[in-house]
């Protein structure tokens, strides 16, 4: 039978710098079992080198010198006795690029270089990025283990060094962030921030990194109510809002959370199963009425919990004044003033710009006040005739504003008659 030297190996292989590759390989050579059994030695050489003198890149012969630059990185993998010549290349370097040939030696008769089946190795720039693994979803306050690994990397060559960076890692000590694994307890403010794992071979210039954006689930921490872009002050889960009667009001309730909380508005202080008056974060009142005084609640419902804020709406109105109007009656000059306001206003009468307070000790005037519904009435009785032309004014005010009206009373009751003199506002 004709002796056969055969090698099955791929013609070319490409690997990224710093990564590993396994090149499958099998060979055959002529051998008879009745031969003596000297050891089988196999070698991988750089193309163009002379087997008798050159340093090998990989061998199973302990007596042959291996190139220092490939030592530990180029390794024979598999059982050569089973004619397996597979070559493992780790921590590939740019200078590894080139052709390699395989050689077999056994005793005096088998010495053969497979020059017709060369392996072409090309080392390219590293574009592979590490993978960051963790169990999703990340939940605020719940510790999570993260690991960083580079697909295609292996133990060969100098060790990999890791570094983690990101706002979420601020409290961690430097030692923790140099491991391939770390435990992170995310906070709400870490949502949307970047976390980067960088890998580097010790002593090499090759670095690669992967950045992920953290998706942190968190329940609402705060609720803010905005009135047309302005945040209302909130004290002990309650916000107070004075609104002018008749004014339009648009309130936006916002509770930052992830995923977004379901926001709804309720009238008053609702039970958990109450029906909302708005199923969005927006409460719109086209014309605020005094009947709406009281409360609204904004509730933020989230799988991780809920929050609610009570909005105490106080409806105010500027004083509206009717009067004064005056007429002569049996007991003297009778002037009336009607007014309406929220909160209830104070009222004073003036005679010639001088305030009339209470009832006069001399009995020259008397003030009476009463209220009916939203309106309050005050009357002034001036006893006796007028000695000169007089200006009578009434003024109503509350903390939001004031309004006054006046009437000019001409001397002599005949001039005034018994008619009503409308206020000159």
């Amino acid at each position: 039978e004709k002796p056969v030297y055969e090698l099955q190996v791929q013609k070319s292989v490409t690997v990224q710098e710093g990564l590993c590759v396994l090149v499958p390989c099998s060979f055959s050579y002529p051998w008879r079992s009745w031969y003596s059994s000297p050891p089988l030695y196999v070698y991988w050489f750089r193309d163009g080198e002379i087997p008798y003198y050159a340093e090998v890149v990989a061998t199973n012969n302990p007596d042959r010198r291996v190139k220092p630059e490939t030592q530990g990185r180029f390794r024979l993998l598999g059982d050569v006795q089973k004619k397996n010549c597979s070559l493992s290349i780790g921590d590939a370097r740019m200078e590894d690029t080139g052709s390699y040939f395989f050689r077999v030696e056994r005793g005096r008769d088998v010495k053969y270089s497979y020059q017709q089946n060369k392996l072409n190795l090309e080392v390219t720039a590293l574009i592979e990025k590490p993978d960051i693994h963790f169990l999703e979803p990340l939940e605020s306050g719940r510790p999570t283990r993260l690991s960083c690994s580079l697909p295609g990397s292996c133990e060969a060559g100098p060790p990999l060094t890791f570094s983690w960076t990101g706002n979420a890692l601020s409290p961690l000590d430097p030692e923790t962030t140099r491991s391939s694994e770390l435990t992170l307890t995310p906070r709400p403010e870490d949502h949307g921030t970047n976390l980067t794992c960088q890998m580097k071979r010790q002593g090499a210039q090759v670095t690669t990194e992967r950045t992920v954006q953290l998706n942190v689930s968190y329940a609402p921490q705060t609720i803010t109510i905005f009135r047309n872009g302005i945040a209302l002050e909130i004290l002990q889960n309650t916000s107070y809002l004075p609104v002018l009667e008749g004014q339009a009001l648009r309130l936006l309730c916002d509770a930052p959370s992830n995923p977004p909380a379901h926001l709804s508005w309720f009238q008053g202080s609702p039970a958990l199963n109450a029906t909302p008056i708005s199923n969005t974060g927006i409460l719109e009142l086209r014309r605020v009425r005094s009947a709406e005084e009281g409360g609204f609640t904004c509730r933020a419902q989230h799988p991780l919990g809920f929050l609610q804020i009570f909005l105490n709406l106080s409806v105010y109105s500027l004083p509206q004044l009717l009067g004064p109007s005056c007429s002569w009656e049996a007991e003297g000059l009778h002037c009336r003033c009607s007014f309406r306001a929220r909160p209830a206003p104070s009222l004073c009468w003036r005679l010639e710009e001088k305030p009339l307070e209470g009832n006069s000790s001399q009995g020259s005037f008397k003030v009476n006040s009463s209220s009916a519904g939203p309106w309050a009435n005050s009357s002034l009785i001036l006893h006796g005739g007028l000695s000169s032309d007089l200006k009578v004014s009434c003024k109503a005010w509350n903390i939001y504003g004031s309004q006054s009206g006046s009437v000019l009373l001409l001397q002599g009751r005949s001039n005034l008659g018994t008619g009503v003199v409308p206020a000159a506002l």
């Epitope: 705060t222 609720i223 009135r227 872009g229 945040a231 339009a248």
Partner: antibody
Framework: QAYLQQSGAELVKPGASVKLSCKAS????????IHWVKQRSGQGLEWIGW????????KYNEKFKDKATLTADKSSSTVYMELSRLTSEDSAVYFC??????????????WGQGTLVTVSA | DVQMNQSPASLSASVGETVTITCRAS??????LAWYQQKQGKSPQLLVY???TLTDGVPSRFSGSGSGTQYSLKINTLQPEDFGSYYC?????????FGGGTKLEMK
């Protein structure tokens, strides 16, 4: 009185990102909403969105939702706006603005001096 | 979204004249309207808010009026420093859109 100091002019390449800052002083930073407004050369004003440092609430104009990202650093009383995937359409002056505390709505009473962003290859 | 339609886009006037700029909203904005003045190369300045309230320090020759969807800014007896661009902005609901602006130039 509120005072807003914006970062300096930026020249950036198409496709890149830029982060503008607006440093607030003269008031309690967490109590006021800060608005961002865009103005292209010789054009009108466009409202981008607001950031409320008190709770981290953000409201975007839908038009800018994928373009602008608003964040803040409470320790330095600074609000940031990051603009991503820049194109020539993003070349503009960007203003930050805030309001009076007692206002009924966020009328922009105080404005930063503006930051000019130029996107060019 | 509420759109703001501002007119005219440009306006030429002389010192001493009276001018009116209008803004029409696509929906009722309930007086939540502001007017700003902007000079070339400067930041806008708030003139009027709540549709008709003048900001402190703004001369009384400026006045705002309107309700519902129609609003206007009137400048009586124009002064040299009044020339520039004017913008309205609503604050009823987000987005808080601006009008297209009015460029007031000296005739």
């Amino acid at each position: 009185q509120a005072y807003l100091q914006q970062s300096g002019a930026e020249l950036v390449k198409p496709g890149a990102s830029v982060k503008l800052s607006c440093k607030a002083s003269g008031y309690i930073f967490t109590e006021y909403t800060i608005h961002w407004v865009k103005q292209r050369s010789g054009q009108g004003l466009e409202w981008i969105g607001w950031f409320y440092p008190g709770s981290g609430s953000i409201k975007y104009n839908e038009k800018f939702k994928d373009k602008a990202t608003l964040t803040a650093d409470k320790s330095s009383s600074t609000v940031y706006m990051e603009l991503s995937r820049l194109t020539s359409e993003d070349s503009a002056v960007y203003f930050c603005a805030t309001h009076e505390r007692a206002a009924q709505a966020a009328w922009s009473a105080y404005w930063g001096q503006g930051t000019l962003v130029t996107v060019s290859a | 979204d509420v759109q703001m339609n501002q007119s005219p886009a440009s306006l030429s006037a002389s010192v001493g004249e009276t001018v009116t700029i209008t803004c029409r909203a696509s929906g009722n904005i309930h007086n939540y309207l502001a007017w700003y003045q902007q000079k070339q190369g400067k930041s806008p300045q708030l003139l009027v808010y709540n549709a008709k309230t003048l900001t402190d320090g703004v001369p009384s020759r400026f006045s705002g009026s309107g309700s519902g969807t129609q609003y206007s800014l009137k400048i009586n007896t124009l002064q040299p420093e009044d020339f520039g661009s004017y913008y309205c902005q609503h604050f009823w609901s987000t987005p808080y859109t601006f009008g297209g602006g009015t460029k007031l130039e000296m005739k």
